[in-house]
């Protein structure tokens, strides 16, 4: 058993049908010695008395709010929570796998620069009695600060039967230079708490792989004289690190047809423009990678052609 | 990724090609290595992060941009310089900042050198035949070094009379090619920053 | 105590169904996952399908994957294992099994598929 | 499809320690916790070892387990007759988990 904050403590079960559970022994906050009682949650059943309850947790039915009185006042709460350990593995029901980029990825993260502040997001089914809560840091033995903000619900969608919850959270690291070769990961830890459930869940990476650069801006058509070709110009994004001649990005320029059968052209530059041939109805786009270090692509930016 | 390469204009900035040559070279090595030792711990995940150069070098912070230098987190405890105009030691007289800079990029390049060279030797005597660094990757180094046109005492290879140990030598390998691509992301920033300068 | 008893095994022709059953009784069926195994004569163990403690989750072999579906009745204690375009490498001895460090098993029901 | 390997027969005569390797890799052995199961003819498996080492009550104690980067054993110090049956080791892959991974199994014959 630890405690997770203030009356707030976890119970660790290896959680197996017929589990002998775990032995826990509580004590009630107060200078009393006599005449304290104890209940669980909203139940006026007396479990027992005196300073010191001892409990056998075995399942859900065993976590909650323990609360000791005397004379029909409340003294202390202590709320338990269980956190299940199957087959030597924590269990994860709290949060879907995203399954990108591989398996198992419960928390994905981004960043559009190398200033030290991302974006991590994760996506649940629950709706009700959910809390997060985040921490961060520059390494794991000898951390160095991250300052993460609240999680936030940030989006609701629907999939299939259910409905899908996305929850966000900004983190930045506390000094952070763009140039720095990083050798020692980010680690992100999320505390997740449904109900009477307690999870957590981490993540571990590099800024320069999750950098995502926002698209290009200002994407422009000039037509040429006489030509079917046109000119195309765009800037870098305004969230992108600078100067831009060292932190420099290199575009996929695609001209796409209406149909999503028709042959895409793609041309690859370090420029900030190109000469493609429009065709009618089609559009074009470009998107946006760091120009050393092959992270993700930004999103496309999109122009018609007419 | 597979995309057209440019060829550089002949005014560019001489270590340019160079550099973007060494992180072509240097990435298309560490791929090769991830897929010929899958069964070894040689992922970013997996293994250590180490820097031969740390404390011996500082590329970083001699190499930073002007623009980077108001940003407190970039001014390490060591004494920074920070690089002005100029070019790859070419014609034009080069300040004295940048060539601390370049001098600590031809040191980072003769440490990597010396290392692969060992290491290259030691995977020769594996029996499994396994794995051998690109030469073309050294080629690369090479001609880096000899753009950057410093003089410098040769280090001499290493040798060792113990028998390698060819599991720990292709995790290092994995380490060292993880960390000089790394440095050849920094080398190539540089590089365009000063050729853009 | 903790028991698991199948039923729903049997002789039946390639292209057609079949569904297994494992009756749970002795503990809190709605808390646990629960896994279905399986076993070819005189071969080895091969794992077949999950499903979380809510049905919430099903995992499947990709040797039956599109075929089988794995389901459960909490309020019947029951997990199922529905098998459809039945194959003569799916004859087998199914078992199903709890998930966790200690865990229980069914006594297995012999499926045979044959024309 | 089977990623953990063991041998398919190791044999010992009464009170012979018998040892059944269990060959995995970085992502299934090497990341997770091993079990080992014991089944008899025309019978489900039995749990003898879970957490690589850990032996349920009833479990005789000439079972034990080990496990050692991507490998894991399973030792019987003085085979009895009644030991003979097929073992299986079962693990996860860090990738697939709860697909449950099963090695080849391993007959172990009691001689004399």
């Known amino acids: 058993i630890w405690e997770l904050k203030k009356d707030v403590y976890v119970v660790e079960l290896d959680w197996y049908p017929d589990a002998p559970g775990e032995m826990v022994v509580l004590t009630c906050d107060t200078p009393e010695e006599d005449g304290i009682t104890w209940t669980l949650d909203q139940s006026s059943e007396v479990l027992g008395s005196g300073k010191t309850l001892t409990i056998q947790v075995k399942e859900f039915g065993d976590a909650g709010q323990y609360t000791c009185h005397k004379g029909g006042e409340v003294l202390s709460h202590s709320l338990l929570l269980l956190h299940k350990k199957e087959d030597g593995i924590w269990s994860t029901d709290i949060l879907k796998d995203q399954k990108e980029p591989k398996n198992k990825t419960f928390l994905r993260c981004e960043a559009k620069n190398y200033s030290g502040r991302f974006t991590c997001w994760w996506l649940t089914t629950i709706s009700t009695d959910l809390t997060f809560s985040v921490k961060s840091s520059r390494g794991s033995s000898d951390p160095q600060g991250v300052t993460c903000g609240a999680a936030t619900l940030s989006a609701e969608r629907v999939r299939g039967d259910n409905k899908e919850y996305e929850y966000s959270v900004e983190c930045q690291e506390d000094s952070a230079c763009p140039a720095a070769e990083e050798s020692l990961p980010i680690e992100v830890m999320v505390d997740a708490v449904h109900k009477l459930k307690y999870e957590n869940y981490t993540s571990s990476f590099f800024i320069r792989d999750i950098i995502k650069p926002d698209p290009p801006k200002n994407l422009q058509l000039k037509p040429l004289k006489n030509s079917r070709q046109v000119e195309v110009s765009w800037e870098y994004p305004d969230t992108w690190s600078t100067p831009h001649s060292y932190f420099s990005l290199t575009f996929c320029v695609q001209v796409q047809g209406k149909s999503k059968r028709e042959k895409k052209d793609r041309v690859f530059t370090d420029k900030t423009s190109a000469t493609v041939i429009c065709r009618k109805n089609a559009s074009i786009s470009v998107r946006a990678q760091d120009r050393y270090y092959s992270s993700s692509w930004s999103e496309w930016a999109s122009v018609p052609c007419s | 990724r597979n995309l057209p390469v440019a060829t550089p204009d002949p005014g560019m900035f001489p270590c340019l090609h160079h550099s973007q040559n060494l992180l072509r070279a240097v990435s298309n090595m560490l791929q090769k290595a991830r897929q010929t030792l899958e069964f070894y711990p040689c992922t970013s995940e997996e293994i250590d992060h180490e820097d031969i150069t740390k404390d011996k070098t500082s590329t970083v912070e001699a190499c930073l941009p002007l623009e980077l230098t108001k940003n407190e987190s970039c001014l390490n405890s060591r004494e920074t310089s920070f690089i002005t105009n100029g070019s790859c030691l070419a014609s034009r007289k080069t300040s004295f900042m940048m060539a601390l800079c370049l001098s600590s990029i031809y040191e980072d390049l003769k440490m990597y050198q010396v290392e692969f060279k060992t290491m290259n030797a030691k995977l020769l005597m594996d029996p499994k035949r396994q794995i051998f660094l690109d030469q073309n990757m050294l080629a690369v180094i090479d001609e880096l070094m000899q753009a950057l046109n410093f003089n410098s005492e040769t280090v001499p290879q290493k040798s060792s009379l113990e028998e390698p140990d060819f599991y720990k030598t292709k995790i290092k390998l994995c380490i060292l090619l993880h960390a000089f691509r790394i440095r050849a992301v920094t080398i190539d920033r540089v590089m365009s920053y000063l050729n853009a300068s | 105590q903790v028991q698991l008893v199948q039923s729903g095994g049997g002789v039946v022709q390639p292209g057609r169904s079949l569904r297994l059953s494992c009756a749970a009784s002795?503990?809190?069926?709605?808390?646990?996952?629960m896994h279905w195994v399986r076993q070819a004569p005189g071969k080895g163990l091969e794992w077949v399908a999950f499903?979380?403690?809510?049905?919430?989750?099903?995992y499947y072999a990709d040797s039956v994957k599109g075929r089988f579906t794995i389901s459960r009745d909490n309020s019947k204690n029951t997990l199922y294992l529905q098998m459809k375009s039945l194959r003569a490498e799916d004859t087998a001895v199914y078992y199903c099994?709890?998930?966790?460090?200690?865990?229980?098993w069914g006594q297995g029901t012999m499926v045979t598929v044959s024309s | 499809s089977y990623v953990l390997t063991q041998p398919p027969s190791v044999s010992g005569t009464p009170g012979q320690r018998v040892t059944i390797s269990c060959s995995g890799g970085?992502?299934?052995?090497?990341?997770?916790?091993v079990k080992w199961y014991q089944q008899l003819p025309g019978t489900a498996p039995k749990l003898l070892i879970y957490g690589n080492d850990q032996r349920p009550s009833g479990v005789p104690d000439r079972f034990s387990g080990s496990k050692s980067g991507t490998s894991a054993s399973l030792a019987i110090t003085g085979v009895q007759a009644e030991d003979e049956a097929d073992y299986y080791c079962q693990s996860y892959d860090r990738g697939t988990h709860p697909a449950l991974l099963f090695g080849t199994g391993t007959k172990v014959t009691v001689l004399g």
């Open positions: 099994k709890t998930h966790g460090s200690h865990d229980n």
């Open positions: 002795g503990f809190t069926f709605s808390s646990y996952g």
């Open positions: 499903i979380r403690y809510d049905g919430s989750n099903k």
């Open positions: 970085r992502s299934n052995i090497g990341s997770n916790k």
